[in-house]
């Protein structure tokens, strides 16, 4: 409504608002305000939100439902919960992927993209923390592998291979000359 006034409504409960002649009750979640009430403290005409729109608030006076968000496929997002008349689509990442926020101060409504989780097994490492809200945290090398540089190297299977000190400590034998 135009103007800046917000007249007080002498109606039972706090969910009334002056719309034209009368103070009208608000609409329930999942509905939008189609027509004002036609008597004091009366019920507004409220209709169910059309498909692909929603309104999450109770006792509101919104005349339009909000459009449901579409999950960003370019950012590898998927719908964890589909949109309903009372709740927006909940976007997230599919199993094996984690949320990477696109802003430094990350909140639930911040833009994000999905990154594939690190596969510790493929790196021949123990999984210390499973990937969900952040990337997988990999631990030490799996049995039969030893630390070499940034990676895990397979223990030699024959005495012909070289086995530095760290290899020997993990793999349990020294190179023979």
């Amino acid at each position: 409504q135009g103007g800046t006034r917000s007249p007080r409504c002498d109606c039972a409960g706090d969910f009334h608002k002056k719309i034209g002649l009368f103070c009208c009750r608000g609409c329930p979640a999942g509905h939008y305000l189609k027509a004002p009430c036609t008597e004091p403290c009366g019920n507004s005409t409220c209709l169910v939100c059309p498909q692909d729109t929603f309104l999450a608030w109770e006792n509101h006076h919104n005349s339009e439902c909000a459009r449901c968000q579409a999950c960003d496929e370019q950012a590898s997002q998927v719908a964890l919960e589909n949109c309903s008349a009372v709740a927006d689509t909940r976007c997230g990442c599919k199993p094996g992927w984690f949320v990477e926020c696109q802003v430094s101060q990350c909140v639930s409504s911040s833009p994000f993209y999905c990154q594939p989780c690190l596969d510790c097994g493929a790196l021949h490492r123990h999984t210390r923390l499973l990937c969900s809200r952040r990337d997988t945290d990999c631990g030490t090398c799996l049995p039969g592998f030893y630390e070499h540089g940034d990676g895990c190297v397979s223990c030699p299977t024959s005495t012909l291979g070289s086995c530095p000190e760290r290899c020997a400590a993990v793999c349990g034998w020294r190179q023979m000359f």
Partner: antibody, heavy 124, light 107 residues
């Protein structure tokens, strides 16, 4: 299409009574509030009375309070105005008018969107 | 009661002229204002609701503006069929009240 057809006007003596009718068609009469508005000869428009769709809310202008009675019969799609103790100053063309309201784009609107053809009441 | 003061009470203009009518409420009525057109011997017709919204089927030469206590009704280019009396009406409060009307004539 929406139509409001009025009847019941005429000449009446001061102190007399008259009943105006307004027959509605082309819309769901029981869903709308209705009004009576009058216009004295050569004068402007004056609101007379309001009745909600279910008849639970009724209002009158001070000038007719206690003398006029608005009513409706949703089964017959009809609106009425019973006028008693008529005075010379009640002489006017009386209109019935539908009160419509709707909300869109963050605002709500109300107004008399359809009117009857009018019926002349002469008190003399 | 909310008093609606409309001016001028009458005006005469040429075809094609811009015509402006003002309506002043005795208190803040927000946007709760309608404009009606009444041709001689006919019932009024709703032209503009909520101060500035054109009713369906009404020519775009008609417009309205304003909020609070002051509202304006404009005919951008007067046509012979616009000869009528125009009324503003508030619906902020009961009783519903109309302005005194503005009679528009062609020179």
């Amino acid at each position: 299409q929406v139509q409001l057809v009025q009847s019941g006007g005429g000449l009446v003596q001061p102190g007399g009574s008259l009943r105006l009718s307004c027959a509605a068609s082309g819309f769901t009469f029981s869903s709308y509030s209705m009004n009576w508005v009058r216009q004295a000869p050569g004068k402007g428009l004056e609101w007379v009375s309001y009745i909600s769709s279910s008849s639970s809310t009724i209002y009158y202008a001070d000038s007719v309070k206690g003398r006029f009675t608005i009513s409706r019969d949703n089964a017959k799609n009809s609106l009425y105005l019973q006028m008693n103790s008529l005075r010379a100053e009640d002489t006017a063309v009386y209109y019935c008018a539908r009160w419509d309201g709707y909300c869109s784009g963050g605002s709500c609107y109300s107004g008399m969107d359809y009117w009857g053809q009018g019926t002349l009441v002469t008190v003399s | 009661d909310i008093e609606m003061t409309q001016s001028p009470s009458s005006l005469s203009a040429s075809v094609g002229d811009k015509v402006t009518i003002t309506c002043q409420a005795s208190q803040d009525i927000s946007n709760y204002l309608n404009w009606y057109q009444q041709k001689p011997g006919k019932a009024p017709k709703l032209l503009i609701y909520d101060a500035s919204n054109l009713e369906t089927g009404v020519p775009s030469r008609f417009s309205g503006s304003g909020s609070g206590t002051d509202s304006t009704f404009t005919i951008s280019s007067l046509q012979p069929e616009d000869i009528a009396t125009y009324y503003c009406q508030q619906y902020d409060n009961l009783p519903l009240t109309f302005g005194g009307g503005t009679k528009v004539e062609i020179k």
